[in-house]
């Protein structure tokens, strides 16, 4: 929606009485107007728990929820009630724009209660206000890294949120590192999770009406040491045309620091080996994994010097690996001429 | 292409043991949450057990709980159902699955009948 | 008798819409996500809808899956007769005993 658009959800008419819970998202500084029920007979409308006013920037007025330009403080849970009744017209979520887009899902909106307004709605039990994100049960992250589970919910009176680890009252005590837990934000906090972590972790969410409960299923990946793995594949064998550019790719995994180098085989004295078996190799390209473009070989304005066979060799703490292609230059004035070039090398 | 392939499954006498195999291929074993799932003849569908990648964490659903184990090989890629105390209405064809994060079993194998009678 | 409560079986003609619904509770489909699985005569299920309305690629749009407090449904327009077929909803239970997958009893799809 733009910022000058207003949110309406529809005329003043009688209401439904199978109003779903919706979510709107509103831009920051956009009007908004909501209606419910007939205009005389209009429901009350409450944000988190307090009836609205019927004057001031944010008013239930006549079935209307009007805010004049919506503010971060004005998201929030809002519930219309039919005047006289406990029955919900209706039942939505307000949000501001930026924070479904936000990859910091912290900021969830403050309940803004006036202690003095004594027009509170009826008992609700606890239930999620944000299931979407609770969708991801089942979590297998490496060892070292953070956790984040979250429980986002709602209710009245406004529930308490426990933590259980396998059933068992979780509080982090035995846990190097401790855990934190934002109660504001419904969320538990791991940092540098070991495989002792694993396990059920329940989110349960309680209030004098009833209570839900949540297990999120986390495993830990140990580490395990291994020499860099190359992508199946590549470097690619490669044809080209003299004085075309040549681009020869390696796709390098490593949980250890690799360094990768890039090699041209050579013929020295007619040879391509050395007395110790190992091939003549040139050394075209050496960096670390985090150099900036050193998985990609460039080759500019290549010539018939520069077919032969090239490797990507790519070693950490733990071993080397390394893979071959073959580049095949063909003359410019010939390019229907190939070569049948050698498969490349894959090797462990 | 992710495959799963069941094996061991046969005739066995009430009381009986068994082991099912479940051979993986075309993903990261390792990382992959994997299930059993039955279905007894002309029946629906029945979780069985699940477990983490790591093997670390394990589930089961009550009506075999103490008596079936659910295990892996990472180095194999091979998911394995220990079956112990077996009863007629342990009778089924036995599914391997795998789980995805959000609880859905995305993959299943062809299955594997389990014939429990005397 | 399945945690989850569907129909036993449901019709339609080709092309109609058939509509598939699943009940349970605030432990399971309140909570969790409802995935929906199709099983042909004589193979194995296959994964038709995820996280409520989720469809794998390779599922034809035909199918859409909705969720709404403790249940679920699964819509198939355009019926045609490959469609026939049991259809068995699913999501896990976070019940007191701990986590577990619960599944509905199955709807059987005759295509008339």
């Known amino acids: 929606l733009e910022a000058s658009e207003e949110v309406e959800l529809e005329p003043c008419l009688a209401p439904s009485l199978e109003q779903q819970e919706q979510e709107l998202t509103v831009a920051l500084g956009q009007p908004v107007r909501l209606c419910c029920g007939r205009a005389e007979r209009g429901g009350h409308w409450y944000k988190e728990g307090s009836r609205l006013a019927p004057a001031g920037r944010v008013r239930g007025w006549r079935g209307r929820l009007e805010i004049a330009s919506f503010l971060p403080e004005d998201a929030g849970r809002y519930l219309c009630l039919a005047r006289g009744s406990m029955i919900v017209l209706q039942n939505l979520t307000l949000i501001t724009g930026d924070s479904l887009t936000s990859s910091n899902d912290d900021e969830d909106p403050k309940s803004h209660r006036d202690p003095s307004n004594r027009h509170s709605y009826p008992q609700q039990a606890p239930y999620w206000t944000h299931p979407q994100r609770m969708e991801k049960k089942l979590h297998a992250v490496p060892a070292g890294n953070t956790v984040k589970f979250r429980c986002p919910a709602a209710g009245n009176p406004t529930p308490t949120i426990r933590w259980l680890k396998d059933g068992q009252a979780f509080h982090g005590e035995n846990r190097i590192g401790g855990i934190r837990l934002r109660h504001q934000h419904w969320s538990l906090v791991m940092e540098s999770v070991v495989p002792s972590d694993r396990g059920t972790y329940t989110c349960l969410v309680e209030n004098a009406v009833g209570s839900i409960r949540y297990n999120y299923l986390l495993d830990v990946l140990e580490r395990s040491p291994h020499r860099p793995i190359l992508q199946a594949g590549l470097p690619a064998n490669t044809t080209a045309v003299v004085g075309s550019d040549v681009e020869l790719l390696c796709k390098v995994y490593s949980d250890a620091q690799p360094h990768i180098q890039w090699l041209k085989h050579i013929v020295i004295n007619g040879s391509s080996f050395g007395a110790d078996g190992f091939p003549y190799v040139q050394v075209l390209k050496t960096a670390d994994i985090n150099s900036s473009e050193v998985e990609v070989l460039y080759l500019r304005n290549v010539s018939a010097e520069d077919a032969g066979e090239y490797t990507c060799l790519a070693g950490n703490s733990i071993g080397l690996s390394y893979q071959s292609a073959w580049l095949t230059v063909l003359p410019e004035e010939d390019p229907t001429w190939t070569a049948a070039a050698p498969e490349a090398r894959y090797t462990d | 292409e992710v495959q799963l392939l069941e094996s061991g499954g046969g005739l066995v006498q009430p009381g009986g043991s068994l082991r099912l195999s479940c051979a993986a291929s075309g993903f990261t074993f390792s990382k992959a949450w994997m299930s059993w799932v039955r279905q007894a003849p002309g029946k629906g569908l029945e979780w069985v057990s699940a477990?983490?990648?790591?093997?670390?964490?394990?589930y089961y659903a009550d009506s075999v709980k103490g008596r079936f184990t659910i295990s892996r090989d990472n180095s194999k890629n091979t998911l394995y159902l220990q079956m112990n105390s077996l009863r007629a209405e342990d009778t089924a064809v036995y599914y391997c699955a795998r789980l995805y994060s959000y609880g859905d079993f995305d993959h299943w194998g062809q299955g594997t009948l389990v014939t429990v009678s005397s | 008798q399945s945690v989850l409560t569907q129909p036993p079986s449901a019709s339609g003609t080709p092309g109609q819409r058939v509509t598939i619904s699943c009940s349970g509770s605030s432990s399971n489909i309140g909570s969790n996500t409802v995935n929906w699985y199709q099983q042909l005569p004589g193979t194995a299920p296959k994964l038709l809808i995820y996280?409520?309305?989720q469809r794998p690629s390779g599922v034809p749009d035909r199918f859409s899956g909705s969720k709404s407090g403790t249940s679920a449904s699964l819509a198939i327009s355009g019926l045609r007769s490959e469609d026939e077929a049991d259809y068995y909803c699913a999501a896990w239970d976070d019940s007191l005993n701990g986590p577990a997958v619960v599944f509905g009893g199955g709807t059987k799809l005759t295509v008339l």
């Open positions: 477990i983490s990648g790591s093997g670390g964490s394990t």
């Open positions: 996280r409520n309305n």
